[in-house]
Amino acid sequence: GQFRVIGPRHPIRALVGDEVELPCRISPGKNATGMEVGWYRPPFSRVVHLYRNGKDQDGDQAPEYRGRTELLKDAIGEGKVTLRIRNVRFSDEGGFTCFFRDHSYQEEAAMELKVEDPFYWVSPG
């Protein structure tokens, strides 16, 4: 069946060194356990995280995300998943695309991450 993919419509903010969660859902909601779910970064489609055949596919990940991501699947039965990125870096700032693929049908949603320096506001001296 067809569905839409929905992500946050406003930029998500995170501090360097913190962790951040990027939520994504399908509408209408349905069990996505058997779907392929992933995040990549445009414009070069570098894989941030991939879930396929009921497992995380670490081997497909871009090196800069290896060991830093986790797919939170507690609501995957409702078609809701969240990508957690640990130890956020300035290079993580920018666009991310989340996609759900069910057999040959795929939809995606774009979202934006803003990364801030936790110390930028401290006045010198």
């Epitope: 419509r9 969660e21 507690d74 969240t82």
Partner: antibody, heavy 120, light 107 residues
Framework: QVQLVQSGAEVKKPGSSVKVSCKAS????????ISWVRQAPGQGLEWMGG????????NYAQKFQGRVTITADKSTSTAYMELSSLRSEDTAVYYC?????????????WGQGTTVTVSS | DIQMTQSPSTLSASVGDRVTITCRAS??????LAWYQQKPGKAPKLLIY???SLESGVPSRFSGSGSGTEFTLTISSLQPDDFATYYC?????????FGQGTKVEIK
């Protein structure tokens, strides 16, 4: 299964404050945005404000700005709504409601409601 | 704030009737609209979200349609359990607003 359990009914005097709690269970509290919605007797639903517990930042409806404070305690998965300078028009049922993650989503789970009566 | 206007305010219908409730937004809200059902003394219950998606566990006789500023909730064949008040709500902006409600009562 997500459940939101609210504190019990309150009777308050005009000019006083009330603090209502909303304890969440099931799911992950960090994946909630919690809003407070009230309903005066025989009236419709009115959004008062909400909070994203992982950030701790609250957002309020203009009508309640300065009179309402919404907080969340991640350690106990509980959200609170405090309304000050109570008047008789604040007599209502107060509901907490969950949005999944961000305030970009519908209210998919609701608390049972807390009746607040303001009377001298 | 975005104003949501529901019509009618009250609707008298019989079991088996097809019922339609309309909701208009004061500006475009894309598809960011939900419908709730509320019974006396109970919390609202989510029926439809994203304008047309049926919430899990909600009977298929409920359907939603529309986008932009005009939306409808349809109950294809009214059942005794459906007599209640229905609210639309926009979540286009982080100051969600509700319609004033439509009470569906027994004719």
């Amino acid at each position: 299964q997500v459940q939101l359990v609210q504190s019990g009914a309150e009777v308050k005097k005009p000019g006083s404050s009330v603090k209502v709690s909303c304890k969440a269970s099931g799911g992950t509290f960090s994946s909630y945005a919690i809003s407070w919605v009230r309903q005066a007797p025989g009236q419709g639903l009115e959004w008062m404000g909400g909070i994203i517990p992982i950030f701790g930042t609250a957002n309020y409806a203009q009508k309640f700005q300065g009179r309402v404070t919404i907080t969340a305690d991640k350690s106990t998965s509980t959200a609170y709504m405090e309304l000050s300078s109570l008047r008789s028009e604040d007599t209502a049922v107060y509901y907490c409601a969950r949005e999944w993650y961000w305030p970009d989503n519908p209210f998919d789970y609701w608390g049972q409601g807390t009746t607040v009566t303001v009377s001298s | 704030d975005i104003q949501m206007t529901q019509s009618p305010s009250t609707l008298s219908a019989s079991v088996g009737d097809r019922v339609t409730i309309t909701c208009r937004a004061s500006q475009s809200i894309s598809s960011w609209l939900a419908w709730y059902q509320q019974k006396p003394g109970k919390a609202p219950k989510l029926l439809i979200y994203d304008a047309s998606s049926l919430e899990s566990g909600v009977p298929s006789r409920f359907s939603g349609s529309g986008s932009g500023t005009e939306f409808t909730l349809t109950i294809s064949s009214l059942q005794p359990d459906d007599f209640a008040t229905y609210y639309c709500q926009q979540y286009h902006e982080y100051s969600p607003t509700f319609g004033q409600g439509t009470k569906v009562e027994i004719k």
